[in-house]
């Protein structure tokens, strides 16, 4: 067995094993997506988070899972069975994914100001129509999740929520914000926790949540809430995690480039040593 043959054999099984791993990963992601779609309640209790934008994530996870499984399957079968058409398709899919990521990166960096303005418009529109339109649930749940995770409230300030009639209290107690703004770590006051927050948090996980204002979780804006707007919170988060984000993007890109190189190398060299390589299958 020549050096070239053993090298190709190594590449073949390396591609197979790695793509098998990604196939399993993709199927896990897909299963999570389906789990959320079928049974939201048990997923919420499993994850232990009240503010998970389930509706949107179920679809995102399911689609991502299928996509990952699809590409990985092409790589797996193409490498193992030494099928040039599948390896070529695998290379093409990875190239398309890589090109999309590069394009997105360029667009984000060049259109940053426009993108920021668009995000602000979207967020403020989501806040204004909070719990009034059943079709907007995904956006609202996603925004609740952002507030909860980034420990912020509103876009500019918590006061962004004061125009939302459905959250408003009576007369002098008008200023209220959603429970995702509530700073659980800052309170020792068990009364507000026991009577207001916890019962409503547990209810947030359920699929069949009515649209009545009585069923909307809101807290006084003067109590233990996050006082920073999410525009600042988002900037802080991006600033603090910039190295990680760039690192992950570079890592994913290099991984894709690596797999593309290996697949095209295997694809091109299958002709020369096809018969001899077949012995080691």
């Amino acid at each position: 067995m020549s050096a070239q043959e053993s090298c190709l054999s190594l590449i073949k099984y390396f591609l197979f094993v790695f793509n098998l791993f990604f196939f399993v990963l993709g199927s896990l992601i897909f299963c999570f997506g389906i789990w959320i779609l079928i049974d939201k309640t048990s997923f919420v209790s499993f994850v232990g988070l009240a503010f998970v934008p389930l509706q949107i994530w179920s679809k995102v996870l399911a689609i991502s899972g299928i996509f990952t499984m699809g590409i990985a399957l092409l790589g797996c079968v193409g490498a193992l069975k030494e099928l040039r058409c599948l390896l070529g398709l695998y290379f093409g899919m990875l190239l398309l994914l890589f090109a999309t990521q590069i394009t997105l990166g360029i667009l984000i960096s060049t259109q940053r100001v426009r993108l920021e303005r668009r995000v602000q418009e979207l967020v403020l529109r989501t806040i204004q129509s909070y719990r009034t339109n059943p079709d907007e649930t995904a956006a609202e749940e996603s925004w609740d999740y952002v507030q909860f995770q980034l420990r912020c409230c509103g876009w500019h300030y918590p006061q962004d929520w004061f125009q939302v009639l459905i959250l408003r209290g009576n007369g002098s107690e008008a200023h209220r914000v959603p429970c995702s703004c509530y700073n659980l770590s800052a309170t020792n006051d068990s009364t507000i926790l026991d009577k207001v927050i916890l019962p409503q948090l547990s209810r947030l996980g359920h699929l069949a949540r009515s649209r009545h204002s009585a069923d909307i979780c809101a807290v006084p804006a003067e109590s233990h809430i996050y006082r920073e707007g999410c525009a600042q919170g988002l900037q802080k988060w991006l600033h603090n995690n910039l190295i990680s984000i760039v690192g992950i993007c570079l890592g994913v890109g290099l991984l894709e480039l690596g797999f593309m190189t290996l697949s095209i190398f295997l694809c091109r060299n299958l002709d020369h040593v096809y018969n001899r390589l077949a012995r080691y299958r």
């Epitope: 500019h156 006061q159 004061f162 125009q163 002098s172 006051d189 109590s223």
Partner: antibody
């Protein structure tokens, strides 16, 4: 029902510190903000600052360096301290329930800064 | 800081008339505005919050309106107890400010 009452020294010498106590009843300091506002004789209202339910504070930007607001939950009291007083700090000092709009006001305490 | 400009500074009106007081902010305050009434020698009283929301116990002849930077308080058929000084106050951002006040006097 909600009650808010300020108690202050009345007369303070220039360059000294002013301390006013606001005693509240009928609501919890953990869920409500308490604001401080002053009104110089014959003039308009000036917002000084607020202490929120969680103890965090917002201050008037021009007074930030010499103003501090604290509270004691157990005594249901909020404290205002203003350092390095000048004659133009002469005013009626009000404390009010509410951090955003001020729903219940105390009767105010007149503080005169004079030698 | 955001500046609040109130107009007019003073107003002489008869009982039964309708009056409108305006308040202009130096930037968009997104309806985070309150109106107060203060009578001579007394503490201010909240009338309206969130620009349009009537506070507890405030008569329906009072109404607030506006958005962005322009706001107004309207008092329909003035009563004798409505005379005094009116202040607007914004609570957008992290520091609040009051308007200069509008003194409402009996004609």
């Amino acid at each position: 029902q909600v009650q808010v009452k300020e108690s202050g020294p009345g007369l303070v010498a220039p360059s000294q510190s002013l301390s006013i106590t606001c005693t509240v009843s009928g609501f919890s300091l953990t869920t409500s903000g308490v604001s401080w506002v002053r009104q110089p004789p014959g003039k308009g209202l000036e917002w000084l600052g607020v202490i929120w339910g969680d103890g965090s504070t917002n201050y008037h930007s021009a007074l930030k360096s010499r103003l501090s607001i604290k509270k004691d939950h157990s005594k249901s009291q909020v404290f205002l301290k203003l350092n390095s007083l000048q004659t133009d700090d002469t005013a009626t000092y009000y404390c009010a329930k509410g951090g955003y709009s001020l729903a219940h006001w105390g009767q105010g305490t007149l503080v005169t800064v004079s030698a | 800081d955001i500046q609040m400009t109130q107009s007019p500074a003073s107003l002489s009106v008869s009982v039964g008339e309708t009056v409108t007081i305006t308040c202009r902010a130096s930037e968009n305050i997104r309806s985070n505005l309150a109106w107060y009434q203060q009578k001579q020698g007394k503490s201010p009283q909240l009338l309206v919050n969130v620009a349009t929301n009537l506070a507890d116990g405030v008569p329906s002849r009072f109404s607030g309106s506006g958005s962005g930077t322009q706001y107004s308080l309207k008092i329909n058929s003035l009563q004798s107890e409505d005379f005094g000084t009116y202040y607007c106050q914004h609570y957008w951002g992290t520091t609040w400010t009051f308007g200069g006040g509008t003194k409402l006097e009996i004609k």
